[in-house]
């Protein structure tokens, strides 16, 4: 005996109470594949979540975070509080970056300033809580009498993007 439910398209469910008729998903529910015997309840974007995309009969809702928060996890499963640049979020709330570290975003942790001397360079611009240091030419390049046929290319540490 052929299962009539396999004919039910996405956006419907196979209603056993009505001789396996394909019924539309009720409001606030969806079925993203055909042949389903129930529709799934739509995700509700409440509290710190706001609706980015409403649920349709074939796809679930998608949420964003309200102002002052940002998404974490797959499909924005959590909202985490924003901090200011120059801060990081701790269990006790937003705290300023310790000396020698910086954070140029509203999320994430404070990261250590680049150590210019490891690359044989000097500090051109000091770091702050919000910005990394800017490394310049090595001290030797700046000494009197040092000359070069071509100016040195701007150096960049591997794995570091320019600020």
């Amino acid at each position: 005996l052929q299962d009539l439910c396999s004919n039910c398209p996405a956006g419907t469910f196979c209603d056993n109470n009505r001789s396996q008729i394909c019924s539309p998903c009720p409001p606030n529910s969806f079925s993203s594949a055909g042949g389903q015997r129930t529709c799934d309840i739509c995700r509700q974007c409440k509290g710190v979540f706001k609706t980015r995309k409403e649920c349709s009969s074939t796809s679930n809702a998608e949420c964003d975070c309200i102002s002052g928060y940002h998404c974490l996890g797959a499909e924005c499963s959590m909202c985490e509080q924003d901090c200011k640049q120059g801060q990081e979020l701790t269990k006790k709330g937003c705290k300023d970056c310790c000396f020698g570290t910086f954070n140029d975003q509203k999320r994430g942790i404070c990261r250590p300033w680049t150590n210019c001397s490891l690359d044989g360079k000097s500090v051109l611009v000091n770091g702050t809580k919000e910005r990394d240091v800017v490394c310049g030419p090595s001290p030797a390049d700046l000494s009197p009498g040092a000359s070069s046929a071509t100016p040195p290319a701007p150096a960049r540490e591997p794995g570091h993007s320019p600020q």
Partner: antibody, heavy 116, light 107 residues
Framework: QVQLQQPGAELVKPGASVKLSCKAS????????INWVKQRPGQALEWIGN????????NYNGNFKTKATLTVDRSSSTAYMHLSSLTSKDSAVYYC?????????WGQGTTLTVSS | DILLTQSPAILSVSPGERVSFSCRAS??????IHWYHQRTNGSPRLLIK???ESISGIPSRFSGSGSGTDFTLSINSVESEDFADYYC?????????FGSGTKLEIK
């Protein structure tokens, strides 16, 4: 800010058809349902149906299934409702409204007059 | 279709008074009820969603309660701008339906 813009009025003859428009702005058009609601003078609101612009899902009130056809033009972020075989009973204000369940933003409404 | 009955058809109150609107559903609809008001010659405006959830930008004097079949919208101190028609709407099942409305008028 979210806005739904509708023409103020339409005058059509009995037996003819009309296509009412609802231009959306201030949000991602394809992510939110558009509903159509009828209100005759001095009467209550009557839900006609809705359409999801992201994939053209539609739901209709059975009373309007042969009367109304809902479509969208994604390129212009505009929803349309085509009303056919018009009679004097179709004279009303027609609103478009955004929302999957509760309708959070409404157009100003189009006053449709069916008269010879 | 789910029938929503609003009573009374007309409510007469003075500014500053507390007022409550009733909406009764013909079957259990959980909390899938939403409230609107509509001023003369204006578009409806969402006041409360899902029976009791507040809406951004709506004054705190508006509140909602109820579940199942009986729902109430309250205004704790009516202001002049609140005199309008009030409608409930259900989103529990297709088709969505509205109540017949209650007119709030000045006593």
């Amino acid at each position: 800010q979210v806005q739904l813009q509708q023409p103020g009025a339409e005058l059509v003859k009995p037996g003819a058809s009309v296509k009412l428009s609802c231009k959306a702005s201030g949000y991602t058009f394809t992510n939110f349902w558009i509903n159509w609601v009828k209100q005759r003078p001095g009467q209550a609101l009557e839900w006609i149906g809705n359409i999801y612009p992201g994939n053209d899902n539609t739901n209709y009130n059975g009373n309007f299934k042969t009367k109304a056809t809902l479509t969208v033009d994604r390129s212009s972020s505009t929803a349309y409702m085509h009303l056919s075989s018009l009679t004097s009973k179709d004279s009303a204000v027609y609103y478009c409204a955004r929302g999957q369940l509760g309708l959070d933003y409404w157009g100003q409404g189009t006053t449709l007059t069916v008269s010879s | 279709d789910i029938l929503l009955t609003q009573s009374p058809a007309i409510l007469s109150v003075s500014p500053g008074e507390r007022v409550s609107f009733s909406c009764r559903a013909s079957q259990n609809i959980g909390t899938t009820i939403h409230w609107y008001h509509q001023r003369t010659n204006g578009s409806p405006r969402l006041l409360i969603k899902f029976a009791s959830e507040s809406i951004s930008g709506i004054p705190s004097r508006f509140s909602g309660s109820g579940s199942g079949t009986d729902f109430t919208l309250s205004i704790n101190s009516v202001e002049s701008e609140d005199f309008a028609d009030y409608y409930c709407q259900q989103s529990n099942s297709w088709p969505f339906t509205f109540g017949s409305g209650t007119k709030l008028e000045i006593k």
